[in-house]
């Protein structure tokens, strides 16, 4: 028989991690693997039908995507949907597919809302999600003794689909649930200095452990301004939520990662400021299959999709689509073996959830509500060379922090700064005031 | 032939102005009128097919509505859509119908966004819209000499679909465009006293001419608190944006409208506070056809829809659906007469736009971008009786303010208070400081 998978992803714009130019080759490789494995869907052909989630400007759209989904449903009655990746595109499509009782599989749609499976029934996320970032940060706080206060800043940039809003939303909600700590969150516009200066006035009163989601340039600007304002000392720690490692120039290999460096007159100051910075990214899979997959992926992208794929963590997304599609096909195979049909979306989905799977991205665990456990890396500066390197990894499945041997977090004080200063944010601790008075007597 | 109109409105919940229990009888009356008129669609049958814009809880839904629209499109390929009315339901449906090039006709969807016909192509609004409220308020400001500053407050109430947000958005944007004045807008939660107290602290610094969108009870509470804080004197004017006249208990007839009255211990204070209040509503049509239509509407609602319709401005919405549907059918008739077809959505829509029409709601003018010109009434207190009555009407077509003979606006000072106090909000006018200093010498 024929198994039809309807794809709703950006078909023209190649800049999204889930653009078809990136995911298409991964899907091809997955389907080639299915063909080569007699235990997967024997006697069946898997075919993909394509619809675009972009509008005429090539931007993800909450109109184009559901319209594409509707057209594909009408014309092809697919067994499953692959994508969308963009939050605003995925939301209506996921609600439609839930109504149609058709599985939706994506390695995008990382926002918190998609974890609510009453609304997004049969949606499986084989890629990373922002609430899982909250699990990592909560584990980090426990490890470092920060159980009282944190500050989260997120940049608004026109046309970036509010990536940072959704990231901080997922992080904020999950950290608050896990730790029961006070978390403040503030938005700022990357292209207006007054937003930075207002943040710098707020920081001393609101936090010492500060998470920032922004572009690499905005993070560097904020660090330079913080240094200028005297907020980059040993009492503060700034985590750049740079999940795809843009500021580290992505890529494999031994090139030094110097996110503070621009080859301009501010490099010396920036390096100094970045002593107080750490960077959080997704974890690059380190299994040999992943490297082999990347080679094939790049080759196929160039040959069949006329697209040159750069190195970097962004490639974990096509890889996750690949693994998710294989997991789905595995679940369909099992459903058929148990007398079900390819249209039995509930049964197929249940076989994907609460399950682990060995994929090109390594060990993949889908949790009991259909979301992948996500691994993260924490990068810190080597004070000798100024290069950032991974000092700690987080295993989403075991929820453990794993130190990289021979490396440790760099703290100017020798230990993590407290999340609330010794005397409180406003020097309100009576004991401190008492000390202060006694020196005057 | 058959002309199919697909309805997407709340089918179960009767509380919306555009609930099917209210609009259904209006549609029946319109279709009866079409049958009775040989010049309208001769030889054609108009039939309606129904889909619900509500979710399982009976609440308007941005998922249920487009899904209903999709199902109706698949099954019936309608020539036009009627509804939705709710903003969040109408948005995806209007974008879908624009993509399908099918006319959408509604007397709801009053938010600013639906005026952007690039996105909502072929959407005609035969009912009132919030930007038109801005035209009225701009005309009022010009008349009263308020061309510098205004303050707009809007209540957030869980489950009311952000009615006040959208109302103030349309008002704010249009007033700002028309007058080039400074307009501040602030949200408050109706059920949190701290929000009221914060507003009262802000008011003296931000405005003297204040627009408030909220429930009648919240408006009364705010007025009582303002009185208590000394902000209800002659220097302030508070406009309650009560578009359906809820606080005036709707209804025909000579019953005194006393929005300050609750029969509680606060009535005396409330009456005093409401000296500084005015109320803005839609204008009740005063043509005899409207009264006749209401009689038939109520009868049909009771007989065929098992629903008892109350009096009030809310009935202008079903009446507007009635007139809009007749206008659509007129446009289809003309299109057919000119050799077009019922599927020629563009042509039909163009015949509805920039056109006037005599309906049960009186003289109806659709502007050049498909939105009805809207009439408003301004109510003020008769200081003798404490009853509110219409003192001024606004004609949307002519954009004129028309005083009701023998009535005038009641100003404690004898004239409208200035929109910026004589010495500025922070007493910053140097001339005033000069005076002030001289009294100290």
């Amino acid at each position: 028989g024929n198994l039809t998978v309807a794809v709703v992803l950006p078909l023209a714009n190649t800049s999204y991690p889930w653009s078809w130019a990136r995911v298409g080759p991964a899907v091809e490789l997955a389907l080639a693997r299915v063909k080569a494995r007699p235990d997967l869907l024997p006697g069946w052909t898997v075919r993909t039908v394509l619809g675009s989630s972009e509008n005429a400007l090539g931007v993800c759209s909450d109109t184009a995507a559901p319209l594409a989904a509707v057209d594909l449903k009408w014309e092809h009655n697919p067994a499953a949907f692959l994508g969308p990746g963009c939050v605003y595109a995925a939301a209506p499509v996921g609600r439609f597919t839930a109504h149609w009782r058709v599985p939706l599989l994506t390695a995008g749609a990382p926002a918190l809302g998609f974890g609510v499976k009453d609304e997004y029934a049969l949606t499986t996320r084989a890629g990373p999600s922002y609430a899982k970032l909250g699990d990592f940060v909560a584990a980090l706080h426990r490890r470092l003794g920060w159980e009282r206060q944190a500050l989260m800043l997120y940049a608004y940039r026109p046309g970036d689909e509010e990536h940072c809003f959704f990231l901080v939303e997922g992080l904020f909600m999950r950290v608050r649930d896990r730790l029961n700590i006070t978390v403040d969150h503030l938005e700022f516009a990357e292209d207006d200095l007054s937003h930075y200066t207002r943040l710098l006035r707020t920081m001393p009163r609101k936090g010492r452990v500060i998470y920032i989601c922004s572009s690499p340039d905005a993070f560097r600007t904020l660090m330079l301004l913080a240094l200028e304002a005297g907020l980059c000392g040993e009492d503060y720690v700034f985590f750049h939520l740079d999940i795809f490692g843009q500021s580290l120039q992505g890529g494999q290999g031994p090139a030094p990662r110097r996110p503070w460096e621009r080859g301009d007159g501010q490099d010396v100051s920036a390096r100094q400021a970045f002593q107080a910075a750490k960077i959080i990214t997704y974890k690059e899979p380190d299994n040999p299959e992943y490297l082999e997959f990347l080679k094939q992926l790049k080759h196929l992208a160039r040959e069949q999709f006329n697209f040159t794929m750069e190195d970097g963590l962004v490639n974990t997304i096509p890889a996750s689509f690949h693994d998710g599609l294989l997991l789905y096909i595995q679940a369909v195979t099992e459903t058929l073996a148990h007398g079900g049909t390819v249209t039995d979306g509930e049964n197929i989905t249940q076989r994907m959830w609460n399950r682990s799977f060995q994929g090109v991205t390594g060990y993949l665990k889908i949790d009991s509500s259909g979301d992948r456990e996500t691994d993260f890396s924490l990068w810190d500066m080597d004070p000798e060379t100024g290069a950032f390197r991974v000092v700690l990894n987080y295993n989403g499945t075991s929820q453990e922090l794993v130190a990289v041997s021979g490396r440790k977090l760099n703290w100017p004080l020798g230990y993590p700064p407290p999340d609330i200063p010794k005397c409180g944010f406003d020097n309100e601790d009576p004991a401190c005031n008492q000390d202060h008075l006694s020196t005057l007597e | 032939g058959n002309l199919t109109v697909a309805v997407v409105l709340p089918l179960a919940n009767t509380s919306y102005p555009w609930s099917w229990a209210r609009v259904g009888p209006a549609v029946e009356l319109a279709l009866a009128r079409v049958k009775a008129r040989p010049d309208l669609l001769p030889g054609w049958t108009v039939r309606t097919v129904l889909g619900s814009s509500e979710n399982a809880l009976g609440v308007c839904s941005d998922t249920a509505a487009p899904l209903a629209a999709v199902d109706l499109k698949w099954e019936h390929n309608p020539a036009a859509f009627l509804g939705p009315g709710c903003v969040y339901a109408a948005a995806p449906v209007g974008r879908f119908t624009a993509h399908w090039r099918v006319p959408l006709l509604t007397a709801g969807a009053p938010a600013l966004g639906f005026g952007v016909k690039d996105e909502y192509a072929l959407t005609t609004r035969a009912g009132p819209s919030y930007a038109k409220l801005g035209d009225f308020v701009a005309a009022l400001h010009r008349r009263l000499g308020w061309e510098r500053q205004a303050l707009m407050l809007y209540a957030y109430r869980p489950g009311d679909e952000e009615h006040c947000f959208f109302l103030v958005e349309g008002l704010f944007m249009r007033v700002r465009d028309r007058l080039n004045i400074t307009v501040d807008h602030l949200e408050f939660a109706e059920d949190d006293l701290s929000h009221y107290t914060r507003l009262l602290r802000t008011m003296p610094r931000k405005g003297r001419v204040i627009y408030i969108c909220s429930s009648p009870d919240a408006f009364r509470t705010l007025m009582l608190l303002a009185l208590e804080a000394g902000l209800c004197g002659e220097d302030y004017v508070f406009f309650h944006l009560d578009i359906f006249g809820q606080s005036l208990q709707g209804g025909q007839g000579p019953a005194p409208r006393r929005p300050w009255e609750r029969g509680d211990g606060q009535d005396v204070s409330a009456r005093q506070a409401f000296q500084a209040a005015k109320i803005i509503t839609y204008k009740e049509p005063d043509n005899p056809e409207y009264l006749e239509f209401l009689k038939q509407l109520k009868h049909l609602a009771r007989e065929q829809f098992n629903f008892t319709m109350e009096d009030g401005l809310v009935n202008t919405i079903p009446a507007s659906f009635h007139d809009g549907l007749l206008l659509y059918i007129q446009a289809v008739t003309e299109t057919l007469a000119h050799g077009g077809t019922v599927t020629d959505g563009e042509n039909i829509t163009q015949r509805m736009w920039n056109r006037s029409f005599q309906g049960v709601t009186g003289y109806l003018k659709i502007d050049s971008s498909g939105d009805r010109e809207t009439d408003f009434s301004l109510w003020d207190m008769d200081p003798e009786t404490g009853a509110f009555r219409v003192v001024l009407n606004y004609n949307g077509t002519s954009q004129e303010l028309v005083a009701v003979s023998g009535r005038k606006l009641n100003w404690p000072l004898g004239y409208p208070p200035p929109d910026i106090p004589k010495c500025g909000f922070d007493n910053e006018d140097p001339a005033c400081n000069q005076d002030h200093l001289s009294t100290l010498e």
Partner: antibody, heavy 119, light 107 residues
Amino acid sequence: EVQLVESGGGVVRPGGSLRLSCAASGFNVDDYGMSWVRQIPGKGLEWISGINWNGGRIYYADSMKGRITISRDNAKNSLYLQMNSLRAEDTALYHCVRDQWLVRGLDYWGQGTLVTVSS
Amino acid sequence: DIQMTQSPSSLSASVGDRVTITCRASQGIYNYLAWFQQKPGKAPKSLIYAASSLQSGVPSKFSGSGSGTDFTLTISSLQPEDFATYYCQQYNTYPYTFGQGTKLEIK
């Protein structure tokens, strides 16, 4: 609407002093850096002084260092430039400019106030 | 101090032409470069910041590019109102420095 209005220019003898003022509206000067830029009639633009958002950093061009002082009064939302020991070559139109260092640069300019140094 | 060298110093062009002005910094300034337009008797007006971002309200016929030390300003289709003097300026490091200007004249 952002507006910058300079005042205090005029004719002064060599060796004399002037205090230029800049009244800002539409934004708070303590949220931004502020700079002074001058232009000799018919010539190019020359940045002469800047103050950062919190007043903690002050910068001067070598050409005027030691002869000028930049300051700010947040309460009055104003910027000042005290100029001493003026020379004929300081004759120029002096612009007050909003300064978004590392973000948008010098984004809003006043029309300028003319300083003429002549005996 | 960082020297900014602009070329050409003057340029004659016709309405409808596409013109390019270049600016070179004596040391790396990443993308901290702005372009200004000045008309006689008026204050300079900011066109572009961060080498390629348009200030709000500036028409899209203006575009900028470059990073490090070499930058260009392009006007895609000259209109009569575009004839003016254009300056580049680095805002990476104090003291800020300007190019000497390019006078764009009608041919």
